[in-house]
């Protein structure tokens, strides 16, 4: 889709003139996320030196974030509708306590930070809708959740910076997975 | 495995109007999120986008080019065409077509034809 | 429209790394990818949107992208990684295309 005014072109798909159906719709929904989470990614490596560290270094951390593997089938070799589409949820159902952990860390993208929250939430919704005959997604535990969320707020300075980039990076790398996989859907 | 055939005139008189087909086989023109553009290379030069024809039959041109480049296309046989008119010496290229797939989320092109050369002249 | 800017030549020593940078305003915004080129033939798509590498492209070859500039790396660059290499990205409008001007990598030794 054409860009939008007030949009970034980081979600160039091709010009579109027609209404949107269902899957541009969600494509372009996952394209204002993924705005979002440039404008964040921005904040926090003007904050820290954080993206000039190496994957490798940043690698060794305890964080469970959500990742794209081969027998998910979201990939393009070994595709399969099904298994990817509840592999997209799940994932994205993970990352919400983490998404509620970004909510205090920025400051001049406050609002982006909500923005980016909001949308994830609204972008489940359309997923579960598009997966109602699906039944293997499972849904993580409030408790567990409201435990983790704590631990995260209680590490140092440090750590909070790089568990803010962590999160940030491998979430726009889910999304993209994401993006790619359900174009094919 | 989709592939891409340029074909047209390889010479073209100064003035005249330019006109190149590009024929798909492996994957439709009218898949979702693909979209279609043309590159030109003069001789020992480097690449120009001229324009893209999406999925759903939308067009879009390079600015430069704009004022003369057209770009539509044929589903039934799925091929994407161009024309660029009053043609000079300045447009001999070598002119492929390529393609944009879905699972690139930028404006990549991760197929291309050989290419065909053209050469403008009298 | 505004193009990208990138060195017409580089040289290096054969095992060396290598890495092409390209520079311009519409890639904080947009994606980049990289095209290698031999002489008589199409370009190939070696790194599409940023940092993701084609089926088929050795792991050598990766991506980078920060603020307005993209880099393409070859780690132990091989003889045959001798070529021209375009970067590519959309306009600010998101609807055009833009290359860059083309980089002639040589490795010697």
């Known amino acids: 889709a054409p860009v939008l005014p007030g949009e970034d072109s980081k979600d160039v798909a091709a010009p579109h003139s027609q209404p949107l159906t269902s899957s541009e719709r969600i494509d372009k929904h996952i394209r204002y996320i993924l705005d979002g989470i440039s404008a964040l990614r921005k904040e926090t490596c003007n904050r820290s030196n954080m993206c000039e560290s190496s994957k490798e270094a940043l690698a060794e951390n305890n964080l469970n974030l959500p990742k794209m593997a081969e027998k998910d089938g979201c990939f393009q070799s070994g595709f399969n509708e099904d298994t990817c589409l509840v592999k997209i949820i799940t994932g994205l159902l993970e990352f919400e306590v983490y998404l509620e952990y970004l909510q205090n860390r920025f400051e001049s993208s406050e609002e982006q930070a909500r923005a980016v929250q909001m949308s994830t939430k609204v972008l489940i919704q359309f997923l579960q809708k598009k997966a109602k005959n699906l039944d293997a997604i499972t849904t993580p535990e409030p408790t567990t959740n409201a435990s983790l969320l704590t631990k995260l707020q209680a590490q140092n300075q440090w750590l909070q910076d790089m568990t803010t980039h962590l999160i940030l990076r491998s979430f726009k790398e889910f999304l993209q997975s994401s993006l790619r996989a359900l174009r094919q859907m | 495995e989709v592939q891409l055939v340029e074909s047209g005139p390889g010479l073209v008189k100064p003035s005249q109007t330019l006109s190149l087909t590009c024929t798909v086989s492996?994957?439709?023109?009218?898949?979702?999120?693909?979209?279609w553009s043309w590159i030109r290379q003069p001789p020992g030069k480097g690449l120009e986008w001229m324009g893209v024809?999406?999925?759903?039959?939308?067009?879009y041109y390079s600015p430069s080019l704009k004022s003369r480049t057209s770009i539509s296309r044929d589903t039934s046989k799925n091929q994407f065409s161009l024309q660029l008119s009053s043609v000079t010496p300045e447009d001999t290229a070598v002119y492929y077509c390529?393609?944009?797939?879905?699972?690139?989320?930028?404006?990549?092109?991760?197929?291309w034809g050989k290419g065909t050369l053209v050469t403008v002249s009298s | 429209q505004a193009g990208l800017t990138q060195p017409s030549a580089l040289s290096v020593t054969l095992g060396q790394t290598a890495k092409i940078t390209c520079q311009g305003g519409?890639?904080?915004?947009?994606?980049a990818h990289w095209y290698q080129q031999k002489p008589g033939q199409a370009p190939v798509l070696v790194i599409y949107?940023?940092?993701s590498r084609p089926s088929g492209i050795p792991e050598r070859f990766s991506g980078s992208s920060s603020g307005g500039r993209a880099t393409l790396t070859i780690s132990g660059a091989q003889a045959e990684d001798e070529g021209d290499y375009y970067c590519?990205?959309?306009?600010?409008?998101?609807?055009?295309?833009?290359f860059g001007g083309g980089t002639h990598l040589t490795v010697l030794g």
């Open positions: 390529a393609r944009k797939s879905s699972w690139l989320i930028g404006y990549g092109m991760d197929y």
């Open positions: 492996g994957g439709s023109i009218t898949a979702s999120f693909d979209a």
């Open positions: 024809i999406a999925y759903d039959g939308s067009t």
């Open positions: 519409s890639l904080g915004s947009s994606y």
């Open positions: 949107d940023d940092d």
């Open positions: 590519q990205s959309a306009d600010s409008s998101g609807n055009a295309a833009v």
